[in-house]
């Protein structure tokens, strides 16, 4: 149904990494505009992102609310300057999203090392705490109270004078790693939901090396 | 449902090379770690080393590191192991395995094997 | 590198008996412990992770546990198809490591 000078969306897209969340669609409008509504499987549509021209639409807000639930999206297209015009079916053209559920599908985002210290052969990483725009009791919550336990990080290190890269994995935001005295070491950390079964690891961060500002030295 | 197959195995002279592959079904290779384990006739398990798909880390043995390389090719969900400068004491068969990647859980997965013998 | 050292290498049981076989790491692994089943000509199995865990669709007789860095694989009461060999693995650092197995066999 939809009248005949507007096109249906298509393509329709979650792009999402920590939480914020965007829909994405095509095509570029040509006379026509777009709104979005947003509703979980048991809940009430939302209309957001009225008579827009974009071809995305912001629903972090919406999604923050309860990140394991399940969302559903659908886009309307309406003609440009008559967005009173309804289809033959009394009803504009939409076209509905895959289901998203963010807790399990939103992108890992690229982590970073906070800072490193070595006291004699042991090294101590500590992966900086993103913040998300997940809120509770009016306060941003981490990443890591968000997913708790169920996100690990996995350290890659090496001596900067060899290229293999030895593994670690804590379920905090700190690592604990044996050295060798007099080696210096880069360090990359990735972020894993090891209970998922797609989008379970997070781009690298960017390599430190010891011997660089961020990290602290200390012999004993 | 999760299956690894190896390929490639046969027999080799010393010095030569030789290509395994490991094909990856039922999961997408870039979001696990792959292994490789050999166990020679009658005797134990040895690891061999690992690569992060996603990134292309790897990290090798002491006995191997330098003449075998661990590669992927994540559009074909499939991992490699490359045997450079074979010796007699790598005849055994090789195993792929999928490293579930959780601090608990480490191999979850192996394949069926494939034999490997250097011999002149 | 750690050691893991696994005994006895070989056992003799009967079908019922208990089964004992201990691996002792070198040094800390914390609980980062798995245990494999090996039959010949196959590939290894997963049977316990975490020193302690039972891994889905293993038979409830296998058990593992830890005290300090020595580990346990207990078998409650033997089956035929338990005869096997079994190896414990640590992935607490890289490299991870192996026992060197131990073979259960029909006395």
């Known amino acids: 149904s939809g009248t005949t000078n507007t096109v249906a969306a298509y393509n329709l897209t979650w792009k999402s990494t920590n939480f914020k969340t965007i829909l994405e669609w095509e095509p570029k409008p040509v006379n026509q505009v777009y709104t979005v509504q947003i509703s979980t499987k048991s809940g009430d549509w939302k209309s957001k992102c009225f008579y827009t021209t974009d071809t995305e639409c912001d629903l972090t807000d919406e999604i923050v609310k309860d990140v394991k639930q399940t969302y559903l999206a659908r886009v309307f297209s309406y003609p440009a300057g008559n967005v009173e015009s309804t289809g033959s079916a009394g009803e504009p053209l939409y076209e509905n999203s895959p289901e998203f559920t963010p807790y399990l599908e939103t992108n890992l985002g690229q982590p970073t090392i906070q800072s490193f210290e070595q006291v004699g052969t042991k090294v101590n990483v500590t992966v900086e705490d993103e913040r998300t725009l997940v809120r509770r009791n009016n306060t941003f919550l981490s990443l890591r109270d968000v997913f708790g336990k169920d996100l690990i990080y996995t350290l890659y290190y090496w001596k900067s004078s060899s290229s293999g890269k030895k593994t670690a994995k804590t379920n905090t935001n700190e690592f604990l790693i044996d050295v060798d005295k007099g080696e210096n070491y880069c360090f990359s950390v990735q972020a894993v939901i090891p209970s998922r079964t797609v989008n379970r690891k997070s781009t690298d961060s960017p390599v430190e090396c010891m011997g660089q500002e961020k990290g602290e030295f200390r012999e004993i | 449902e999760v299956q690894l197959v190896e390929s490639g195995g046969g027999l080799v002279q010393p010095g030569g090379s030789l290509r395994l592959s490991c094909a990856a079904s039922?999961?997408?290779?870039?979001?696990?770690?792959i292994h490789w384990v050999r166990q020679a006739p009658g005797k134990g398990l040895e690891w061999v080393g690992y690569i992060d798909p996603y990134n292309g880390y790897t990290y090798y043995a002491d006995s191997v590191r330098g003449r075998f390389t661990i590669s992927a090719d994540t559009s074909k969900n499939t991992a490699y192991l490359q045997m450079n400068s074979l010796r007699a004491e790598d005849t055994a068969v090789y195993y792929c395995?999928?490293?579930?990647?959780?601090?608990?859980?480490?191999?979850?997965?192996w394949g069926q094997g494939t034999l490997v013998t250097v011999s002149s | 590198d750690i050691q893991m050292t696994q005994s006895p290498s070989s056992l003799s049981a009967s079908v019922g008996d208990r089964v004992t076989i201990t691996c002792r790491a070198s040094?800390?692994?914390?609980?980062?412990v798995a245990w494999y089943q090996q039959k010949p000509g196959k590939a290894p199995k997963l049977l316990i992770y975490?020193?302690?865990f039972l891994y889905s669709g293993v038979p409830s007789r296998f058990s593992g546990s830890r005290s300090g860095t020595d580990f346990t694989l207990t078998i409650s009461s033997l089956q035929p198809e338990d005869f096997a060999t079994y190896y414990c693995?640590?992935?607490?650092?890289?490299?991870?490591?192996f026992g060197q197995g131990t073979k259960v066999e029909i006395k």
């Open positions: 039922g999961f997408t290779i870039s979001d696990y770690w």
């Open positions: 975490s020193a302690s």
């Open positions: 693995q640590q992935h607490y650092t890289t490299p991870p490591t």
């Open positions: 395995a999928r490293d579930y990647g959780s601090l608990q859980v480490f191999i979850d997965y």
């Open positions: 040094q800390d692994v914390n609980t980062a």
